[in-house]
């Protein structure tokens, strides 16, 4: 004969534990019915009456199946500096991630807690290390022979031109100029992306960024001496 | 107000380890580069070692690559420097800063009050 | 490594007098170049950075000029407050050196 199924509320039997999607009730000594996601529990079960649940008012939400007497609420609007990729539903929580050119300097369990600017390499200084969601841009000194004239947060250094004759020549903030009309470029370009540059000067490399303890979400830009724009908060 | 507090400092014997922390308040540490920077007493000023907001990138000068280590935590807004292998010539006050924001803005802006570290049997 | 000389090692000078501190760098370092003021027993202050920019609150009578390899500081009308030691320090490739510094000391 087949086992019989018991209805919630019921006793467990000694030793065991109540089964998916119930939870025991200390009060009643009883497993019960949780509420499903989008719904809380608005009043919890008894020896006789099941749970019953209510759907979630606006603006809050659970998750996960439950027995919680509130739904929680979800997060503040998305912050200026942050996009909203994934809206506050009555089974979801509102998520925030940084909008394009910022990054998570300080993340939160879902979405990010302060978002900052990407840093810009200034002239002389390329992209060694692209920024990401959650890490800022890296940059480093033009090695000889390449050059970056821009202020970027994604501008690598390139290669100087080369010239037949050079009028002026090239620095590490500077294409050369040359005197003749039709200048070659230079013949690896692909080496630009190097995270260390390649260079016959020793006192021009830059040491490649060494990996540490340290958690890899971070940033934002200092505009002179005086703190930064201090990005943003999304709570 | 922008502050950086050194601790840590102390007398250790050559050959010694010693961290020195540096607990920051006043800006958003988490986007911020860091430094230490030291000075033997009655010398002039040495860069040890740097470490961008992320933690990705650390340099380090050529007197203490190998023994020291920078490290952040950005939850607890903390700077560290693990000094092992201590010489004689260690023996400074450690300077914690912030900055340089690297390859944008090239300076150290503020400064810690420093902690002394002496390395001597 | 980019060797920094700065020049002179010490001076003596008077309230009201101009001083000038050079900075040469054995590569370019294109201006990424801070100068910073230590007094006895503080902390070194930022007093410019760029090698021309003024940093926050610091006094107009502090200037900076130069570009490439030789750079220079100029305080206009010496103060009293201004006797201290001052240092020059690039921000090109690392090792990121400091010259020696230079100490203004009251004649």
């Known amino acids: 004969l087949p086992a019989q199924v018991a209805f919630t509320p019921y006793a467990p039997e000694p030793g065991s534990t109540c089964r998916l999607r119930e939870y025991y009730d200390q009060t009643a000594q009883m497993c019960c019915s949780k509420c499903s996601p989008g719904q809380h529990a608005k009043v919890f079960c008894t020896k006789t009456s099941d749970t019953v649940c209510d759907s979630c008012e606006d603006s809050t939400y659970t998750q996960l199946w439950n027995w919680v007497p509130e739904c929680l609420s979800c997060g503040s609007r998305c912050s200026s500096d942050q996009v909203e990729t994934q809206a506050c539903t009555r089974e979801q929580n509102r998520i925030c991630t940084c909008r394009p050119g910022w990054y998570c300097a300080l993340s939160k369990q879902e979405g990010c807690r302060l978002c900052a600017p990407l840093r810009k390499c200034r002239p002389g200084f390329g992209v060694a290390r692209p920024g990401t969601e959650t890490s800022d841009v890296v940059c480093k000194p033009c090695a000889p022979g390449t050059f970056s004239n821009t202020t970027s947060s994604t501008d690598i250094c390139r290669p100087h031109q080369i010239c037949n004759v050079v009028a002026i020549p090239g620095n590490a903030s500077m294409d050369a100029v040359c005197t003749s009309t039709s200048p070659t470029r230079s013949m690896a370009p692909g080496a630009v992306h190097l995270p260390q540059p390649v260079s016959t000067r020793s006192q021009h490399t830059q040491p490649t960024p060494e990996p540490s303890t340290a958690p890899s979400t971070s940033f934002l830009l200092p505009m002179g001496p005086s703190p930064p724009a201090e990005g943003s908060t999304g709570d | 107000e922008v502050q950086l507090v050194e601790s840590g400092g102390g007398l250790v014997q050559p050959g010694g380890s010693l961290r020195l922390s540096c607990a920051a308040s006043g800006f958003a540490f988490s986007t911020y580069d860091l430094s230490w920077v030291r000075q033997a007493p009655g010398k002039g000023l040495e860069w040890v070692a740097y470490?961008?907001?992320?933690?990705?990138?650390?340099y380090y000068s050529d007197t203490v690559k190998g023994r020291f280590t920078i490290s952040r935590d950005n939850a607890k807004n903390t700077l560290y420097l693990q000094m092992n292998s201590l010489r004689a010539e260690d023996t400074a006050v450690y300077y914690c800063?912030?900055?340089?924001?690297?390859?944008?803005?090239?300076?150290?802006?503020?400064w810690g009050q420093g902690t002394l570290v002496t390395v001597s049997s | 490594d980019i060797q920094m000389t700065q020049s002179p090692s010490s001076l003596s000078a008077s309230v009201g007098d101009r001083v000038t501190i050079t900075c040469r760098t054995s590569e370019s370092i294109y201006s990424n170049l801070p100068w910073y003021q230590q007094k006895p027993g503080k902390a070194p202050k930022l007093l410019l950075y760029?090698?021309?920019k003024l940093a926050e609150g610091v006094p107009s009578r502090f200037s900076g000029s130069g570009s490439g390899t030789d750079y220079t500081l100029t305080i206009s009308s010496l103060q009293p407050e201004d006797f201290a030691t001052y240092y020059c320090q690039h921000f090109w490739v690392t090792p990121w050196t400091f010259g020696q510094g230079t100490k203004v000391e009251i004649k």
């Open positions: 800063v912030r900055g340089p924001f690297y390859g944008s803005a090239n300076y150290f802006d503020y």
């Open positions: 470490i961008n907001n992320g933690g990705i990138s650390t």
């Open positions: 760029d090698a021309t």
